[in-house]
């Protein structure tokens, strides 16, 4: 979706020798790394599905779009793309599906034009807090990143470190306040159970936020108030049960917002009344007529928009003396 694209103009392919061979000399302007295809006209280099274990050292200085997908990179060290002269034009970098499990501090340093970065479909067990900021200063130099695509970067359960995966990702997003200019953030399919409460407040430029296909149960402690530029919020395929008044008011007040809520297990009891009232009048929810109840059983598959207050009841809590064992 947001990964770098290239035109289909003349790709030259290099001889198939090992890409890990380090060249002491700066690369020739028209040189193409082994196992890659290059198009100077399109400013694009593609090293796709070649089982590379390292980032090629001899990338041409003209590269603007770099595809390193479907490889076996494992680790992205500090300065993985630092070159002399620097890759000053590199704007879009796609590393998806390259078996990365570790991204170290400063991995993307010396890429002054990097606007799009896609790390999707890598089992990132170890994402340094300083992966994107490059330094451990409390305020780093602003990152040029505008789009950060981190879909399906959750490692398998047995490979996770003894810490919160959500916390690890958020630490990298917030370090040094480097990503203040970020406009698109995709975090789909990461088994997120919660969203740390401070993350959105520190990404004020966000236009597009994709949190779909996670396990978010509640947004009670998440504030959208400061995201005045937010245009799309994808919350499909989570575990949301209800949205409460505070969240509804914040979403309703955002001037550009479109919200996507499909395929959540909505609980249609008395706590749902405010949300149903809101849904009936709001225009910000896309496809709101598709939202259906999952619980309680008697309400399953009922359309939220068709419910009225009489449908939304809560079973009374019996006093202890009336409860049966």
């Amino acid at each position: 979706s947001s990964s770098p694209t290239s035109s289909a103009s003349s790709f030259s392919s290099s001889a198939p020798f090992l890409a890990s061979a380090v060249s002491a000399q700066p690369p020739l302007p028209d040189q193409c790394p082994a196992l890659c295809e290059c198009s100077e006209a399109a400013r694009t280099v593609k090293c796709v599905n070649r089982n590379l274990t390292e980032v090629p050292t001899d990338l041409p200085a003209y590269v603007r779009n770099l595809f390193l997908t479907g490889n076996q990179l494992a680790v992205l060290p500090a300065g993985a793309f630092a070159r002399r002269p620097p890759l000053a034009e590199l704007a879009a970098l796609n590393l998806s599906g390259s078996r990365l499990d570790e991204v170290r501090a400063g991995a993307f340093e010396h890429l002054p034009s990097l606007r799009q970065l896609d790390l999707s479909h890598n089992p990132l067990a170890d994402l340094s807090p300083f992966a994107f900021s490059g330094s451990n200063a409390s305020v780093s130099a602003p990152s040029p990143l505008v789009e950060l695509i981190l879909n399906h970067i959750v490692p398998p359960e047995d490979e996770r470190q003894n810490r919160s995966f959500e916390g690890m990702v958020v630490a990298a997003l917030l370090a040094g306040r480097a990503l203040q200019g970020l406009r698109r953030l995709e975090l789909a399919s990461n088994h997120f159970l919660y969203l740390p409460r401070d993350v959105l407040a520190q990404l004020p430029s966000l236009r597009h936020l994709d949190l779909s296909n996670n396990s978010l149960v509640s947004l009670t402690y998440v504030s959208f108030r400061n995201l005045t530029h937010l245009e799309s919020l994808h919350l499909e395929d989570n575990a949301l049960k209800v949205l409460h008044n505070g969240t509804l008011a914040e979403l309703q007040g955002l001037p550009h917002i479109r919200v996507f809520l499909d395929n959540n297990p909505w609980v249609c009891d008395c706590h749902m009344a405010d949300m149903v009232t809101w849904l009936k009048e709001t225009e910000v929810v896309q496809g709101k007529d598709r939202l259906t109840c999952a619980y309680p059983e008697k309400m399953r598959n009922r359309v939220l928009l068709e419910l009225n207050s009489a449908d939304l009841d809560c079973d009374p809590i019996l006093p202890p003396s009336l409860q049966t064992s």
């Epitope: 245009e231 007040g253 917002i257 996507f260 225009e283 496809g287």
Partner: antibody
């Protein structure tokens, strides 16, 4: 740059029909609600209706004053908004504007076309 | 339908002074904490131009001389200091309920 250009206005007899078009550019047309508003000479603005975006099924809402006579539609492949006007009356004479709703449609219209003039007279 | 009553119908203000235009709604235009009331400026032969949305948010590119206030049913547009370029018609609009409705307009002139 967002641009809206209306066309199709002109002189029509009472009881006649007219179709107005609005060519949109500079934004993702299918993401936005679109609207028609009219203004008789020297008078206030009157909202005629809107058509929703792709996410909300391109359904329409119309003002009671034109319901049954005016129809709003859109050609999303060409980014064109239409207003089909039937059974026209003298009081329908006005400048007709097409307008784009903000991303959150509750905040109403942020961009307007220059308008096209419709005169209903025998 | 929600009726918007705008007053005064016309207003003459000296350059550099403050102009205040009011708009009253027949029922609340608030929805989940936001008042969905806009202000537009219209010059002769031109389409309306959005100045203020959500009662008090100044549209991008609009001079800071323009401000909006109010909530529920009572709203005002303030221009200070008034400049020659501000000579125009001003309309309020509610988008809380369908049909959206406009006020009758206020004509701003220079004294």
């Amino acid at each position: 740059e967002v641009k809206l250009v209306e066309s199709g206005g002109g002189l029509v007899q009472p009881g006649g029909s007219l179709s107005l078009s609005c060519a949109a550019s500079g934004f993702t047309f299918t993401d936005y609600y679109m609207s028609w508003v009219r203004q008789p000479p020297g008078k206030a603005l009157e909202w005629l209706g809107f058509i929703r975006n792709k996410g909300n099924g391109y359904t329409t809402e119309n003002s009671a004053s034109v319901k049954g006579r005016f129809t709003i539609s859109r050609d999303n492949s060409q980014s064109i908004l239409y207003l089909q006007m039937n059974a026209l009356r003298a009081e329908d004479s006005a400048t007709y504007y097409c307008a784009r709703y903000r991303g959150n449609p509750h905040y109403a219209m942020d961009y307007w076309g220059q308008g096209t003039s419709v005169t209903v007279s025998s | 339908d929600i009726v918007l009553t705008q007053f005064p119908a016309s207003l003459a203000v000296s350059l550099g002074q403050r102009a205040t235009i009011s708009c009253r709604a027949s029922e609340s235009v608030e929805f989940y904490g936001t008042s969905f009331l806009q202000w537009y400026q219209q010059k002769p032969g031109q389409p309306p131009k959005l100045l203020i949305y959500g009662a008090s948010n100044v549209e991008s590119g609009v001079p800071a001389r323009f401000s909006g206030s109010g909530s529920g049913t009572d709203f005002s547009l303030s221009i200070h200091p008034v400049e020659e370029d501000d000579i125009a018609m001003y309309f309020c609009q509610q988008s809380r309920k369908v049909p959206s409705t406009f006020g009758g307009g206020t004509k701003l002139e220079i004294k």
